[in-house]
């Protein structure tokens, strides 16, 4: 019961996490820039992984996509890649984990198969979460190190002057969504891996042993019957008794005078 709960909870937590990673990847507010020195209107500038937006205090908003790949900073491309890899791994992990759920019966799937699938999905969730956390952290590091501030008090060839507006980029909402979502996916993955241990059937091989009436020459040896767990000394299914007790295989293969009374 506890295993099923752990697995189910891991699945739900991972599902929420991956939904969050997708949301963060699509969001426009990865970085925000406030402008205060404008005599016309307050302008709020914010960027995502795919487009940049400008919102005026009047409510007018204009967004434009980054239609070039060559001009984009390598770090931005790396963040995009990390987030997409995270989403893809997470989506595959979700698909696998659905079939691995203990509460869902699919044909005659054994517990060992479900355990393996649970472990696979768990690992996928962990990697997915790490990708998201890494992507968001790389972007955050770019903001902290003022990566964007590349044009400051330069003169253009036309004789006009360009000045960077004295504002700084701050962390957008998408960064926090990404961190939390990545963390949830990671936790969900760990829970799936823990659930996998409970799902895996222990190797307790109780071999069928047939007992037959034997002659007076066979002495009963007390304490002879042992359940083979794979870790004891009786791992090869050897005869425990000298006389009439044999495994099914031995009975069929080697009939003796004592077998029939």
């Amino acid at each position: 019961m506890a295993v099923t709960a752990c697995q189910g909870l891991g699945f739900v937590v991972s599902l929420i996490g991956i939904a969050g990673i997708i949301a963060a990847t699509c969001m426009d507010q990865w970085s925000t820039q406030d402008l205060y020195n404008n005599p016309v209107t307050a302008v709020f500038n914010y960027q995502g992984l795919w487009r940049s937006c400008v919102r005026e205090s009047s409510g007018f908003t204009e967004c434009r996509g980054y239609f070039t790949l060559l001009g984009l900073p390598a770090m931005l491309q790396a963040v995009r890649a990390l987030m997409i890899v995270g989403i893809v791994l997470g989506a595959i992990g979700l698909l696998v984990s659905i079939f691995a759920l203990k509460c869902i019966r699919i044909g005659s799937m054994e517990d060992s198969a479900k355990a393996n699938m649970t472990l696979t999905s768990g690992i996928m969730f962990i990697v997915s979460g790490l990708c998201a956390i890494a992507g968001v952290s790389v972007f955050a590091n770019m903001l902290v190190t003022n990566f964007w501030m590349s044009t400051a008090n330069m003169y253009t060839g036309m004789g006009g002057m360009v000045q960077t507006v004295q504002t700084r980029y701050t962390f957008g909402a998408a960064l926090f969504v990404g961190w939390v979502a990545g963390g949830l996916t990671l936790i969900g993955g760990v829970m799936m891996c823990i659930a996998c241990r409970g799902l895996a059937p222990e190797e307790t091989n109780y071999k069928a042993v047939s007992y037959h009436a034997s002659g007076h020459s066979v002495a009963y040896k007390p304490g002879g019957f042992k359940a083979s767990t794979g870790f004891g000394s009786n791992t090869k299914n050897k005869k425990i008794y000298d006389g009439g007790a044999r495994t099914e295989d031995e009975v069929q293969s080697y009939p003796s005078k004592h077998d029939y009374v």
Partner: nanobody, 121 residues
Framework: QVQLVESGGGLVQPGGSLRLSCAAS????????MTWYRQALGKEREFVAG???????NYADSVKGRFTVSRDNAKNTVYLQMNSLKSEDTAVYYC???????????????WGQGTQVTVSS
């Protein structure tokens, strides 16, 4: 980069009219706000009028009712229609654009080289 070129300045009599224009060119990603400033000899640069892409406009008290700012978003051009000109309007008029040359760059203040407007009889 974004280049701004002003035109339309010149000598005009008091009470006359002039129309200034400022065209932005270059690697423009977005120009949310375009603004006109002026600087008279020996004075500080002051705000005249401006307009946002959304159509919000603002004017300095000294030019309200006389000047009109307009904008052609398709051409990335801002206009300043100046009527009932006075001698105190004599100055070098500068065009300013808050723009980004790339979407992932911060908005920057770009300035034109200025155009001279002289109001004299």
């Amino acid at each position: 980069q974004v280049q701004l070129v002003e035109s339309g300045g010149g000598l005009v009599q008091p009470g006359g009219s002039l129309r200034l224009s400022c065209a932005a060119s270059g690697s423009i990603f977005s120009i949310p706000v375009m603004t006109w400033y002026r600087q008279a000899l020996g004075k500080e640069r002051e705000f005249v009028a401006g307009i946002s892409k959304g159509g919000t406009s603002n004017y300095a008290d000294s030019v309200k009712g006389r000047f009109t700012v307009s904008r052609d978003n398709a051409k990335n051009t801002v206009y300043l229609q100046m009527n009932s000109l006075k001698s105190e309007d004599t100055a070098v008029y500068y065009c300013n654009a808050q723009a980004s040359s790339f979407g992932w760059m911060p908005l920057s203040d770009y300035w034109g080289q200025g155009t001279q407007v002289t109001v004299s009889s």
